[in-house]
């Protein structure tokens, strides 16, 4: 029995920063559960993880360097990345786990979400600013 | 009650390769990560790394060119190897539960490296 | 990687007091911290992870307080089976890495 994955095919990230929700067909509610995020298209790089353990504070943490957070829903898990880099544009998955009440559950592979980071533009100063206000 | 038992060669000779096995008993195997943590005589702690049931591994940089840590699921151990040790790894080997936090812990290994 | 320093590196309290251990890393690991004790000859026992989550089985009497780079794990009231070395160690940046410990010895 697999769990199912739903997710955005496709964010934006303005600000070099984005928000990644990442639902589930299974409520969390009073699991212990490990949901993480991976970039690449074989899942290579592990970007954030989120430990549940029932009514305990959520765990966030990455093992890769990324700046993450991430915040619990019932049936959800909501990833928050922050300075992105342009060329960490790419394919990210979402992953759970249930490791407590047995039996081990985790998901069927998602479709992934296409995270396109852009840089910030600076908008560059006039040539000849106006007359100054005082 | 997640219990965790360890064994392996307690003397070394330099050159050689440390061998250690950690065995889980009484938990889920799966969805955790497993980890090796080492203790110098008189000394503090240093990860050396883990591994999960599907074999995805961390390193320690400072260890990652010598060690090798392997999984076994149908028996629920996992492994420990060190490859050409010197006096420098003589000490306590433990094996935990955990990739961010340590518990339970194996009861420690003694390991010493001496010509 | 992340230094983490503990001091005082020996802390001498009589049974019955407070004792305060402080743990310092070199930059920002939010709450990403935990708390050891380790009596000689045994492994170390979680006692704090998440910078002030009590472990399973871990008494109230264990506290644990901060983030960023200052946290602290307090003793309300010491009991003669808490003469121990403590240890910090971080798990926001990898490899994790741990402080070098706090003896606490009785007074």
């Known amino acids: 029995n697999k769990i199912l994955v739903k997710q955005s095919p496709m964010l934006v990230a303005y600000d070099n920063a984005v928000n990644l929700s990442c639902k589930y067909s299974y409520n969390l509610f009073s699991r212990e559960f490990r949901a993480s995020l991976h970039k690449g298209l074989d899942s290579a790089v592990e970007v954030c993880v989120v430990y549940g353990n029932y009514s305990q504070q959520l765990q966030v943490y990455s093992k890769t360097g990324f700046n993450c957070d991430g915040k619990l829903g019932n049936e959800s898990v909501t990833f928050y990345l922050q300075n992105l880099y342009v060329n960490q544009t790419d394919i990210y998955f979402c992953k759970i786990e249930v490791m407590y009440p047995p039996p081990y559950l985790d998901n069927e592979k998602s479709n992934g979400t296409i995270i396109h980071v852009k840089g910030k533009h600076l908008c560059p100063s006039p040539l000849f600013p106006g007359p100054s206000k005082p | 009650q997640v219990q965790l038992q360890q064994w392996g060669a307690g003397l070394l000779k330099p050159s050689e390769t440390l061998s250690l096995i950690c065995a889980v008993y009484?938990?889920?195997?799966?969805?955790?990560?497993w980890s090796w943590i080492r203790q110098p005589p008189g000394k503090g702690l240093e990860w050396i790394g883990d591994i999960n049931h599907s074999g995805n591994t961390n390193f320690n940089p400072s260890l990652k060119s010598r060690v090798t840590i392997s999984v076994d699921t149908s028996k629920n151990q996992f492994s420990l190897k060190l490859s050409s040790v010197t006096a420098a790894d003589t000490a306590v080997y433990y094996c935990a539960k955990g990739e961010a936090w340590f518990d339970p812990w194996g009861q420690g290994i003694m390991v010493t490296v001496s010509s | 990687e992340i230094v983490m320093t503990q001091s005082p590196a020996t802390l001498s309290v009589s049974p019955g007091e407070r004792a305060t251990l402080s743990c310092r890393a070199s930059q920002s690991v939010r709450s990403n911290l935990d708390w050891y004790q380790q009596k000689p000859g045994q492994a170390p026992r979680l006692l704090i992870y998440?910078?002030?989550t009590r472990a399973t089985g871990i008494p109230a009497r264990f506290s644990g307080s901060g983030s960023g780079t200052e946290f602290t794990l307090t003793i309300s009231s010491l009991q003669s089976e808490d003469f121990a070395v403590y240890y910090c160690?971080?798990?926001?940046?990898?490899?994790?890495?741990f402080g070098g410990g706090t003896k606490v010895e009785i007074k």
């Open positions: 998440g910078a002030s």
């Open positions: 009484g938990g889920s195997f799966s969805g955790y990560y």
């Open positions: 160690q971080q798990y926001n940046n990898w490899p994790l890495t």
